[in-house]
């Protein structure tokens, strides 16, 4: 009987990330007796919900239940039945729903009501659905990556547990790119902030952190593309838009009503003499880059330094983890390696965008054309945002680490969100040592 395995004393948590383009469900697991230790929570499952983001269900809310079924059933399978009732479920909606709420608070509420009704039908401990703020999204992303990198641990290790981990306790900045917003979060050199709205103060594991964060609504990759199209069609002489951000030979018809559906294009809205226009790709990185830069207003700054649109940005400091769409896009383009310089990335983007559409389709036959067609824009947008928007340079580019997962857990806001809501990040350092050395072996 001595050799009989004891039942695992573990806990689970579920977070649904209801993004603008899709919803993902994450299942986390941790040893029950080590709740307050740093780095013990890890992701055991990610389930991507089939279909668009929840904001797209505004005219078909009755379909939300079916939409969520597969991933919720998957959670039922992964988590032992005996633990269903004590497993918390959180749904956080991000910029897609922020935009819907700007259009109609009532419609946004209706979507969340139906989401809540659907999730309440499962045997888990459902804790509600809410639209998280851009500030939360940035802060929780920062907490996630630093928790996973072991930056909150008081032990200084002589070796690294992840490839890009530096052995000091300096935290990583967080760069998050979604479909509808983008967040930048880091600990600046100077703790005093010129802009209190962008300042957060945390006490985690006995240490104080003064964090800068900002979320740029409408500057996620999908909404930035809509903005660019709305801006460029203003000066088109007819219903043909020759677009440098799409491959030569690429053609796509866009409805003007779709273009002006989002609040993000309101500033460019005008009465056009046509209901549709056709994008015709010309595949020119430099021109695409120039067109994107017009989305960033850098002429006005009421602070010592700004990112764009008059938003304060302190001088960049330390290493940064760039995740979500920053990672997915750069991974597709094969540009995530630490060895690839900014100049090399630019060169690769010039070549990629100039490739004919037919050639691209052949080379990436397995990729959906809708996504495939937008990598030239997305890659160029990432470069423009990081270099001109956030003021990274060729030198500081080397401090950007494109991260998908850290020790098996996805980089993103969901883990930090759950750690906070389950009170698993103590303000003070726990008395017991966080992890024994043997854990690392």
């Amino acid at each position: 009987t001595q050799n009989k395995a004891l039942p695992e004393n573990v806990k689970y948590g579920i977070v649904l990330d209801a993004g603008s383009s899709h919803t993902s469900l994450y299942i986390y697991k941790w040893p029950a007796e080590k709740e307050n230790d740093t780095g013990v929570v890890h992701q055991v499952e990610e389930c991507r919900v089939k279909g668009p983001g929840i904001s797209k269900f505004v005219q078909k809310v009755n379909e939300i239940g079916i939409y969520l079924t597969d991933c919720m059933e998957r959670a039922r399978e992964v988590i032992p039945r005996s633990q269903h009732q004590e497993t918390p479920v959180y749904l956080g909606a991000t910029a897609g729903m922020r935009l819907l709420r700007m259009e109609s608070e009532e419609l946004a509420d209706r979507v969340l009501d139906v989401v809540e009704r659907s999730l309440s039908n499962y045997p888990f401990d459902f804790q509600g659905a809410r639209i998280i703020t851009g500030q939360e999204e940035g802060a929780y992303g920062w907490i996630t990556i630093n928790y996973l990198l072991g930056k909150f641990s008081q032990k200084t290790r002589w070796f690294s547990i992840v490839p890009y981990e530096t052995n000091n306790q300096e935290t990583f900045g967080a760069l998050d790119l979604g479909g509808a917003s983008t967040q930048v979060t880091f600990v600046p050199q100077n703790a005093t902030s010129e802009s209190p709205a962008n300042a957060l103060a945390f006490r985690l594991y006995g240490k104080d952190y003064n964090v800068y964060t900002h979320s740029f609504l409408c500057y996620g990759k999908d909404q930035a593309l809509w903005q660019k199209l709305a801006k460029d069609i203003q000066v088109a002489s007819n219903e043909i838009l020759r677009d440098p951000c799409f491959h030569p030979g690429y053609k796509k018809v866009v409805n003007v009503s779709d273009l002006y559906k989002t609040p993000c294009t309101k500033r460019f809205e005008m009465t056009l003499p046509f209901q549709q226009f056709e994008i015709q790709g010309i595949g020119n990185y430099q021109q695409c880059h120039q067109s994107i830069l017009e989305l960033f207003n850098t002429s006005y700054c009421p602070y010592s330094q700004c990112a764009f649109n008059g938003i304060f940005l302190p001088p960049l400091q330390g290493d940064f983890g760039a995740f979500s769409a920053f990672y997915f896009v750069m991974k597709f383009l094969n540009l995530t390696s630490e060895k690839v310089s900014q100049e090399k990335v630019t060169e690769m983007m010039k070549k990629f965008c100039a490739q004919p559409w037919e050639e691209i389709k052949t080379s990436y036959a397995g990729v959906k054309e809708k996504y495939l067609s937008e990598y030239c824009f997305s890659g160029t947008y990432i470069l423009s945002l990081l270099l001109q928007g956030y003021h990274f340079t060729a030198d500081s580019w080397e401090h950007i680490h494109f991260i998908g997962k850290i020790q098996g857990s996805d980089a993103g806001w969901t883990l930090g969100y759950m750690l906070n809501l389950t009170n698993m990040i103590p303000a003070e350092q726990p008395l017991s040592t966080p992890l024994s050395h043997s854990t690392y072996v």
Epitope: R101, E105, L112, D113, R117, F126, Q127, R130
Partner: antibody, heavy 121, light 107 residues
Framework: QVQLVQSGAEVKKPGASVKVSCKAS????????MHWVRQAPGQGLEWMGR????????WYAQKFQGRVTMTRDTSTSTVYMELSSLRSEDTAVYYC??????????????WGQGTLVTVSS | EIVLTQSPGTLSLSPGERATLSCRAS???????LAWYQQKPGQAPRLLIY???NRHTGIPDRFSGSGSGTDFTLTISRLEPEDFAVYYC????????FGGGTKVEIK
């Protein structure tokens, strides 16, 4: 569908306290704030305060501070409004009204049927 | 606190006529923070308009809201028999306040 069902009419003596309940159903109770508004006979509407059922935090109108207490019981999806040191001018119909989700705007989307509180010696 | 003054106090009109109700704030109110309610005798108020001009679910399109800053208007384009009631405006700026109400009665 969303329903807010309030407790029955009360008759109280001056100086006493009254506790009115409002039971919510048809939605996730913790997701929306709950407000209390009163209306004296033949008069207009007067906002008393609100409670966030998720965390129990409250915000009271200046006029009622120190006399009003709003609480909630998440297990029964019920909010309570207690008014102490009653006087004759507190005679009114008291309404609970569902407010906003976090991050929304403060308008009152759904109202209870009202509870008449009469203060008389 | 912001004071809302509604005028007129009473509006006597016939069915089919247009009703224009005014709500003036003692200081500027963000449009997204102004709402209108209807109350019939013995009933709880009912939300009509939020965000100054957005109709609540199920509210007929004869009701419309407009205005910004300190001056807001509720318009009922063609009065139906069921529209005769008291109408309140409401603002939110740290605390909620209501206007004194306008009674729309049958002439």
């Amino acid at each position: 569908q969303v329903q807010l069902v309030q407790s029955g009419a009360e008759v109280k003596k001056p100086g006493a306290s009254v506790k009115v309940s409002c039971k919510a159903s048809g939605y996730t109770f913790k997701s929306y704030e709950m407000h209390w508004v009163r209306q004296a006979p033949g008069q207009g509407l007067e906002w008393m305060g609100r409670i966030n059922p998720s965390v129990g935090s409250t915000w009271y109108a200046q006029k009622f501070q120190g006399r009003v207490t709003m609480t909630r019981d998440t297990s029964t999806s019920t909010v309570y409004m207690e008014l102490s040191s009653l006087r004759s001018e507190d005679t009114a119909v008291y309404y609970c009204a569902r407010g906003k989700r976090e991050g929304g705007t403060e308008y009152l989307r759904k109202w209870g049927q009202g509870t008449l509180v009469t203060v008389s010696s | 606190e912001i004071v809302l003054t509604q005028s007129p106090g009473t509006l006597s009109l016939s069915p089919g006529e247009r009703a224009t109700l005014s709500c003036r704030a003692s200081q500027s109110v963000a449009s997204s923070y102004l709402a209108w309610y209807q109350q019939k005798p013995g009933q709880a108020p009912r939300l009509l308009i939020y965000g100054a001009s957005n109709r609540h679910t199920g509210i007929p399109d004869r009701f419309s809201g407009s205005g910004s800053g300190t001056d807001f208007t509720l318009t009922i384009s063609r009065l139906e028999p069921e529209d005769f009631a008291v109408y309140y405006c409401q603002q939110y700026h740290n605390a909620i306040t209501f206007g004194g109400g306008t009674k729309v009665e049958i002439k």
